[in-house]
């Protein structure tokens, strides 16, 4: 299930997706003065099973005399099958890098993409929230944003940050550096069955960062 | 697939300069930060600096504050890194590495860690001796 919205923007905060989770589709944008290529992919997609996750396709730009004046799709999931699978992994990363079970990594850059990235979030989508430089964070729990189902409507929930000014006091005393837990999110949500799969990231990650990735149109 | 290409790397005594420059050409620099990450023999790979290619902001290791210099040319699609002042300590294979910027194409110092960059150059080595 796609996600209806982006994720929540939060006043002097950026965020991204750390990881995307398998069904997340991501346009094969490119700058102004390309367009893909004839027989290119509109998309690429994340796939795979328990053990491994790619994306599948690949985005290629050329050189453009006119204008690419192609739609920004949400492609439907019949036109998911029988696409090429192509591993979008650098030669060069290195052997520590994190991954989560049923996610795929950003995809590595393709030359001469759009500088925005339109990514088709699924439910169960996270991504991280950080303030930006000269911005402190007050935490009152995650600064994290997960699409739910709720309702058999879907939203993102509401990370739990304040981000403020150097010189600005404190509001939640001894509350600026606290380890974001994934559980027990605070939602003033009325009771009813919320269909997620909120999966926990690793501790490593998230105690580094409470940071994001992107998110359907995040720059 | 785009490719980062370092150059600029050699030999230098103590207390002199070295230039760095990473090349790569077709990445749409405004998308991206883009940067410097080290590794010396038996060490982790550590970042030394980045600059955010939407906004020229630049972040430096403390190790390397007023001693070096990063800078961006987008039109050339390059990144320099300006060594001076070199210490024995600097000596390591210097990786070119690129990260997708966050929302609102800003970028934190917190992500620029060694397993979460997008693309890495083969990297170029820097000898400094005493």
């Known amino acids: 299930e796609l996600c209806d919205d982006d994720p929540p923007e939060i006043p002097h905060a950026t965020f991204k997706a750390m990881a995307y989770k398998e069904g997340t589709m991501l346009n094969c944008e490119c700058k102004r003065g390309f367009r893909r290529i004839k027989s290119g992919s509109l998309y690429m997609l994340c796939t795979g099973n328990s053990s491994h996750s790619s994306w599948d396709n690949q985005c290629q730009c050329t050189s453009s005399a006119t204008r690419n004046t192609t739609k920004q799709v949400t492609p439907q999931p019949e036109e998911q099958k029988e696409r090429k699978t192509t591993e979008m992994q650098s030669p060069m990363q290195p052997v520590d890098q994190a991954s989560l079970p049923g996610h795929c990594r950003e995809p590595p850059p393709w030359e001469n993409e759009a500088t925005e990235r339109i990514y088709h979030f699924v439910v169960g989508q996270m991504v991280y929230y950080q303030c930006v430089q000269g911005y402190r964070a007050l935490h009152r729990g995650p600064a994290e944003s997960v699409c739910k189902m709720t309702h058999g409507k879907t939203r993102w929930t509401q990370p739990q940050l304040i981000c403020t000014g150097e010189m600005e006091t404190s509001q939640f005393p001894g509350e600026e550096k606290p380890q974001a837990s994934p559980e027990g999110r605070p939602e003033s949500e009325t009771s009813c069955l919320v269909t997620t799969t909120d999966f926990q990231i690793q501790t490593e990650m998230a105690a580094t960062m409470e940071t994001s990735i992107f998110t359907t149109e995040y720059q | 697939q785009l490719q980062l290409v370092e150059s600029g790397g050699g030999l230098v005594q103590a207390g002199g300069s070295l230039r760095l420059s990473c090349a790569a050409s077709?990445?749409?620099?405004?998308?991206?930060?883009i940067g410097w990450f080290r590794q010396a023999s038996g060490k982790e790979r550590e970042g030394v600096s980045y600059?955010?290619?939407?906004?020229?902001?630049?972040f430096y290791a403390d190790s390397v504050k007023g001693r070096f210099i990063i800078s961006s040319d987008n039109a050339k699609n390059t990144v320099d890194l300006q060594m001076n002042s070199l210490k024995p300590d600097d000596a390591a294979v210097y990786y070119c590495a690129v990260d997708r910027l966050g929302s609102r194409g800003a970028y934190v110092s917190t992500w620029w860690r060694s397993p979460d960059m997008d693309l890495w150059g083969k990297g170029t080595l820097v000898t400094v001796s005493s």
């Open positions: 600059i955010n290619g939407r906004d020229g902001s630049t």
């Open positions: 077709g990445l749409t620099f405004d998308g991206y930060a």
